[in-house]
Amino acid sequence: IWELKKDVYVVELDWYPDAPGEMVVLTCDTPEEDGITWTLDQSSEVLGSGKTLTIQVKEFGDAGQYTCHKGGEVLSHSLLLLHKKEDGIWSTDILKDQKEPKNKTFLRCEAKNYSGRFTCWWLTTISTDLTFSVKSSRGSSDPQGVTCGAATLSAERVRGDNKEYEYSVECQEDSACPAAEESLPIEVMVDAVHKLKYENYTSSFFIRDIIKPDPPKNLQLKPLKNSRQVEVSWEYPDTWSTPHSYFSLTFCVQVQGKSKREKKDRVFTDKTSATVICRKNASISVRAQDRYYSSSWSEWASVPCS
Amino acid sequence: RNLPVATPDPGMFPCLHHSQNLLRAVSNMLQKARQTLEFYPCTSEEIDHEDITKDKTSTVEACLPLELTKNESCLNSRETSFITNGSCLASRKTSFMMALCLSSIYEDLKMYQVEFKTMNAKLLMDPKRQIFLDQNMLAVIDELMQALNFNSETVPQKSSLEEPDFYKTKIKLCILLHAFRIRAVTIDRVMSYLNAS
């Protein structure tokens, strides 16, 4: 058993049918010695008396808010949560496996640049009685500071019969140098509590591996005289690290017909312009990627050919 | 400790092309190592990230773009002295700081070159003959060093009398390649910045 926060405790259980569970001793936080009784949640049934209460915690029915009273007055509370270990592996019931980029990916994180700011998000089908708390650091043995905000519900989607809820959090490394070469990964830890179930999820990454630039901005077309060709130009996104000559991007320019089946023409360039043939009803899209370190491509920025 | 904007004339910067070749070569070699050594811990998540140049060179700090010198987090640099007469400098106006930066890059390349050559000698003794260093990568390191053209003491190739532990050697190869790729990215950024300035 360990303390998650004041008066909230996590009991770790080896989870299998007929498991013996864990013996837990609760102590009433009071100078009083006599006349103390214990109850669980809203029930008025007295579970025991005395300054300490010994319970055998086996299942969720044994978890909850234990309260010690004296003469109708509440003295203190202890909330017991359960953390299930199923055949040596901690349970992952609360969050959905996003399966990208690999199986068992519960937290996904992205950064728009090298400033040390990043966003993580996760999915669940649970809509109520759910709380998250996020901590982060650079490295784990001698951790350096990363400050995270509160996790917020950022999207709701309908997936088949189920509703899916996306939560996200923004974090910022306290002293980040954009040019630094990372040797210690960022660690992100999410505590999830659903009713009386506790779970924790972690992700470890280097900022350089989660870079996804914003799409190029100010995408414009300039027709070339007496030609079906157009000059496409764009700019680096505002959110990208500066100076751009040091933090350079490379670009992919795509001409896509109305039908998804039509052949796509693609050009790769390090410049912020390109000359392409603009077909009728086609659109031109441009996306960006770090020129020197192949992390994710940005989303496409698009303009119609007409 | 930073790169001023007054740098060589446009088109007078032969190192950019070499640094791009270097990044391509080390990335290809790393990919080959990850595929060939699939049963070894060779992915970024599995290896320890060690920098063999730590406390010996200070490339990131010495080559910091001027715009980032206002960022205090970038300025906790270690002072290191370098020889400063390189041919990539193609302009008499080149500052001392830039020379320091390029000589730091040269020292990095020299250290990695020695490590890779020592390692290759060990890998050639492996009866499994599972993996060797790409000669192209070693040649590209050499080309960039020649383009930088710094006079520096030759570091003798390390020789070991004991029987090599091939498993450890292959894991060390992965660690070196990961670190060298990260350094090659920094070198490419620096060359791009200098070329544009």
Partner: antibody
């Protein structure tokens, strides 16, 4: 006392369907994940499928994906394996088993796919 | 499709020490715990060892398990006639959990 009693095995022709059941007692069935494991005659153990305690997630071996469906009825304390498009290579003894560091197995039920 | 490799058979005379190996990789045994099962002819498998080296109550202490790196082993010290059975190791793969990975199985024969 934890008990898993299996039923539903038998002889079936290739291409036909069969549904196996596993009735649980002696524990809170709705709190635990469950597996199906099979063993072809004279061969080793092969995992078939898994279902979470609440039925929210199901996982299958590649060899049965798209043909077999694992399900549970927590109100009846019963686990099911619906097998469709059966093949000769599905002939085996099928076991249900609880998920956990200490597990309990059903007695097994024989499924024979033969024309 | 077995990723955990066991010797097909091992044998010993009563009282001898018999060991069975189970060889895997970094993503399975290297990252997860190992179980061992005993299966007597015509019966369901019985758990002998869980969490690499733990014995459930009721399992004789002549059975012991260990794990090192990407392989595990089961030892029977002082093998007895009633130990003649098939033995299977089981683990998980970190990418496909909760799918159970079983070893190929080992037939233990007690001679004499």
């Amino acid at each position: 006392q934890v008990q898993l009693v299996q039923s539903g095995g038998g002889v079936v022709q290739p291409g036909r369907s069969l549904r196996l059941s596993c009735a649980a007692s002696g524990f809170t069935f709705s709190s635990y994940g469950m597996h199906w494991v099979r063993q072809a005659p004279g061969k080793g153990l092969e995992w078939v499928a898994f279902i979470r305690y609440d039925g929210s997630n199901k996982y299958y071996a590649d060899s049965v994906k798209g043909r077999f469906t694992i399900s549970r009825d927590n109100s009846k304390n019963t686990l099911y394996l619906q097998m469709k498009s059966l093949r000769a290579e599905d002939t085996a003894v099928y076991y249900c088993k609880t998920h956990g560091s200490h597990d309990n197995w059903g007695q097994g039920t024989m499924v024979t796919v033969s024309s | 499709s077995y990723v955990l490799t066991q010797p097909p058979s091992v044998s010993g005379t009563p009282g001898q020490r018999v060991t069975i190996s189970c060889s895997g990789g970094r993503s399975n045994i290297g990252s997860n715990t190992v179980k061992w099962y005993q299966q007597l002819p015509g019966t369901a498998p019985k758990l002998l060892i869980y969490r690499n080296d733990q014995r459930p109550s009721g399992v004789p202490d002549r059975f012991s398990g260990s794990k090192s790196g990407t392989s595990a082993s089961l030892a029977i010290t002082g093998v007895q006639a009633e130990d003649e059975a098939d033995y299977y190791c089981q683990s998980y793969d970190r990418g496909t959990h909760p799918a159970l990975l079983f070893g190929t199985g080992t037939k233990v024969t007690v001679l004499g």
